[in-house]
């Protein structure tokens, strides 16, 4: 009861708080549970008690065990237990599960990763952050106070993040690291009336006769996975498959891309060896989902050559 697990790495600082709540003015006595021996309060000791905090500066594997704290208020004595485990440093990059703090989830809108337990320490900014043991670099990552902010979170930002900072005690510096997993969750999806990003409505595209050209129909349908979302080209109001002109083909399959978290679909109309008659056709980009159909029309025109004298 009233027991709290704490862990750390050898040769790093570890500070543990008594798991009983109280005022900072309350007297707190700390003991080794196994021996009932009192833990000293003098700071010259490597392991010493400081009010509600028990400090290992630095920690050793042999410090592992259960520590008892008794919080003495004027009206009650409350007992708590700190179950401390100190591990040897890992030779490789792998952070074992038993060294991991709670997993945090982020999304495009909220991507804060707090450095666990840092509030117990006397540290100064900035924190160093690592992902899967690699130092984080680039403008997407911002170390802010005790947390890391990731801009434009993507699914591959998921992973194990380690914060590293220095604890200062009476002029002496001690390193501390803490690792937690970060998962990226899709924000709640929604669908909306199709928005065609390309082509613009009633656009005209200049083409060279005899050359090849591509027309892209691109539309967005909402956020997250969409139940029904298709884009397609029509020629003079007819499906491409009904239009018997092998030079004009709509590419198989539709690329699904996510722009600003929106679910967008593209399809490309490929016209080989552009002919004069192609300029007479009406090209319709159609976007369809459960909300309805939107149509943007584009026409082709001959490219004008400007002769320079």
């Amino acid at each position: 009861k009233f027991s709290k697990q704490s862990w750390g790495l050898e040769n790093e600082a570890l500070i543990v708080r008594c798991p009983r709540q109280g005022k900072s003015s309350y007297i707190v006595d700390w003991y080794y549970s196994q021996t009932n021996k009192s833990i000293p309060t003098q700071e010259r000791n490597r392991v010493f008690a400081s009010g509600q905090l028990l400090k290992f500066l630095p920690a050793e594997v042999a410090d592992s065990g259960i520590y008892t704290c008794i919080v003495r208020s004027p009206t009650f004595n409350r007992t708590g237990y700190a179950n401390v485990t100190i591990y040897k440093k890992q030779p490789d990059c792998n952070v074992p599960d038993y060294l991991m703090y709670s997993t945090v989830s982020g999304s495009e809108k909220n991507s804060k990763i707090y450095c666990p337990t840092i509030d117990l320490y006397n540290w100064t900014a900035p924190l160093e952050w690592f992902k899967n043991c690699q130092a984080l670099q680039g403008s997407r990552y911002k170390a802010h106070k005790s947390f890391l902010v990731i801009d434009n979170v993507m699914t591959d930002d998921a992973g194990d993040y380690t914060c590293k900072f220095i604890h200062n005690e009476n002029g002496a510096n001690y390193s501390v690291t803490a690792t937690r997993s970060f998962t990226v969750k899709d924000e709640q999806g929604f669908s909306l009336f199709p928005v065609i990003r390309a082509p613009a409505h009633n656009e005209t595209k200049e083409v060279e006769i005899g050359e090849n050209t591509n027309l892209t129909c691109s539309a967005c349908f909402g956020k997250g996975a969409q139940f029904l979302a298709t884009v397609q080209w029509q020629l003079n109001g007819n499906k491409i498959t009904d239009f018997s002109e092998p030079r004009i083909q709509q590419e198989e399959g539709q690329n699904q891309s996510f722009s600003n978290g929106l679910a967008c679909v593209n399809t490309v109309l490929r016209i080989a060896d552009v002919k004069e008659e192609d300029l007479l056709l009406r090209y319709d980009c159609l976007a369809l989902n459960l909300h309805g159909l939107r149509r943007h029309t584009i026409r082709l025109s001959r490219k004008h050559h400007h002769h320079h004298h």
Epitope: K1, F2, Q21, G22, K23, S25, Y26, V71, S73, P74, T75, F76, R78
Partner: antibody, heavy 117, light 106 residues
Framework: EVQLVQSGAEVKKPGATVKISCKVS????????MHWVQQAPGKGLEWMGR????????EYAEKFQGRVTITADTSTDTAYMELSSLRSEDTAVYYC??????????WGQGTLVTVSS | DIQMTQSPSTLSASVGDRVTITCITN??????IHWYQQKPGKAPKLLIY???TLRPGVPSRFSGSGSGTEFTLTISSLQPDDFATYYC????????FGQGTKLEIK
């Protein structure tokens, strides 16, 4: 012997505000928490909230949130509980009690507040 | 919010009886339960804190037990002074009293 002495009974109209005091003797109010408890006639005890007088931190039960304000004057070792927008169901005995974060050890004698038009 | 269900609401017993009052919570509260006795017109008095720690000056016939979600107050041999209302209090999350148990003479 720790003693908590509360202010006298009050009669208030609906919509009014009442402020009850609780003076502590043989004890430094800063050294512990001060809790307030409501007991309607013939009913059970209902915790209202607590204050850490040394720093002024307060926590209130959801039921009273927004209507109750607990304060403390450490220079006079006196705690106060103010309840606003009074209604008939606030008719009750109000107790102050000192203790730690988790429980109350010493109690005041109680203050009866009657809300009536 | 943590809900407390105290039972029974009324208990009739005689001097010398062994009586048990129970408090059940809707979530594990890690022994942060306390027992109070209240007599008519008086402030409550703390009997037991932290599940089973007897407050100084409280007779040893009072005892507390239980853990997790079910807690009991036992009076091993009722004395005339024990007829009162008893409340459990949880302080795992804020503070919540049980509804009370009125212990009356049979």
């Amino acid at each position: 012997e720790v003693q908590l002495v509360q202010s006298g009974a009050e009669v208030k109209k609906p919509g009014a505000t009442v402020k009850i005091s609780c003076k502590v003797s043989a004890f430094n109010i800063k050294d512990d928490y001060m809790h307030w408890v409501q007991q309607a006639p013939g009913k059970g005890l209902e915790w209202m909230g607590r204050i850490d007088p040394a720093i002024g931190n307060t926590e209130y039960a959801e039921k009273f949130q927004g209507r109750v304000t607990i304060t403390a004057d450490t220079s006079t070792d006196t705690a106060y509980m103010e309840l606003s927008s009074l209604r008939s169901e606030d008719t009750a005995v109000y107790y102050c009690a000192t203790g730690d974060f988790y429980a109350m050890a010493y109690w005041g004698q109680g203050t009866l507040v009657t809300v009536s038009s | 919010d943590i809900q407390m269900t105290q039972s029974p609401s009324t208990l009739s017993a005689s001097v010398g009886d062994r009586v048990t009052i129970t408090c059940i919570t809707n979530t594990d509260i890690d022994d942060v339960i306390h027992w109070y006795q209240q007599k008519p017109g008086k402030a409550p008095k703390l009997l037991i804190y932290e599940g089973n720690t007897l407050r100084p000056g409280v007779p040893s016939r009072f005892s507390g037990s239980g853990s997790g979600t079910e807690f009991t107050l036992t009076i091993s041999s009722l004395q005339p002074d024990d007829f009162a209302t008893y409340y459990c209090l949880q302080s795992d999350n804020m503070l919540t009293f049980g509804q009370g148990t009125k212990l009356e003479i049979k």
